[in-house]
Amino acid sequence: EEELQVIQPDKSVSVAAGESAILHCTVTSLIPVGPIQWFRGAGPARELIYNQKEGHFPRVTTVSESTKRENMDFSISISNITPADAGTYYCVKFRKGSPDTEFKSGAGTELSVRAKPS
């Protein structure tokens, strides 16, 4: 069976301050079982943007019903974008465990923030 891939089709997205940004992510397999997390940046300084499993992420909504077991679309919308939101966003698949372990990351989508039109 082909190994799961994390696909982020957009290399970059540009959004005006105050608007919402949609970041696309799909996976190619339901295996291994485990949650998706979104991060801004890579490495130890990365910021957790969304965790499918736990936490409250008020500016983030999932584009599809990510809680459905057969779902493979983990795209998100981030509302009320500010300059501090600019950066590269990674959709990351985790393998279920205690604790969950990182399995595979998407290639990233760079979000740039334009000045709010006056």
């Epitope: 801004r40 130890p44 300084a45 910021e47 936490g55 501090a84 939101d85």
Partner: antibody, heavy 119, light 108 residues
């Protein structure tokens, strides 16, 4: 209910060190960035430091850079502030504060820990 | 760095008399402004976020408005328990996170 409880405050001499702790409960601690904010006697609020949810990303106010170190232990739901080379002007009540999300305001505050630096 | 200037420094009002507090940013912060209340001897408490949204459990006599650089916190009918210092906080540009200098509200 979200609870943040600071401990470790006290009286120290200039040049000495102190470590503050903030015990968190009532929320998924490992999912949120955390901050330290201080308030000198009779003064306003001054942001001191921030740490991201995983603990690998930190930011500091210029006034404490190189002297203070923020850290966290997500397995213990605890936030720390290691304060070295303390100065009289570091005398303040130190509050830990939870962020609403990674790029946002502070939605919950601890009760504070008093740090007094005096010779 | 964005500087937040609050005015007036002190505001004295009678119970039931509208109180209006101002916070001005040195550059636009969009709607990314919060208000915190700090009563004497207590920790700060979040009142308003995103300029106009009341935090959980905050009475509706507190309201926030504004965007860009000029923001207002209004206490429509102040109660004696509203005596406190009120701080604005911006989170549009960071670090550092910035607070205003505070407005002390006294209820006569």
């Amino acid at each position: 209910d979200v609870q943040l409880v600071e401990s470790g405050g006290g009286v120290v001499r200039p040049g000495e060190s102190l470590r503050l702790s903030c015990a968190a409960s009532g929320f998924s601690f490992r999912s949120y960035a955390m901050n330290w904010v201080r308030q000198a006697p009779g003064e306003g609020l001054e942001w001191v430091s921030r740490i991201n949810s995983g603990g690998g990303g930190t930011d500091y106010a210029d006034s404490v850079k190189g002297r203070f170190t923020i850290s966290r232990d997500n397995s213990k739901n605890t936030l720390y502030l290691q304060m070295n080379s303390l100065r009289a002007e570091d005398t303040a009540v130190y509050y830990c504060a939870k962020q609403y999300d990674w790029n946002s305001f502070f939605d919950y505050w601890g009760l504070g820990a008093l740090v007094t630096v005096s010779s | 760095e964005t500087v937040l200037t609050q005015s007036p420094a002190t505001l004295s009002v009678s119970p039931g008399e509208r109180a209006t507090l101002s916070c001005r940013a040195s550059q636009t912060v969009g709607s990314k402004l919060a208000w915190h209340q700090q009563k004497p001897g207590q920790a700060p408490r979040l009142l308003i976020y995103d300029a106009s949204n009341r935090a959980t459990g905050i009475p509706d006599r507190f309201s926030g408005s504004g965007s860009g650089t000029d923001f207002t916190l209004t206490i429509s009918s102040p109660q004696t328990e509203d005596s406190a210092v009120y701080y604005c906080q911006q989170y549009y540009y960071w670090p550092p996170y910035r607070f205003g200098g505070g407005t002390k509200v006294e209820i006569k």
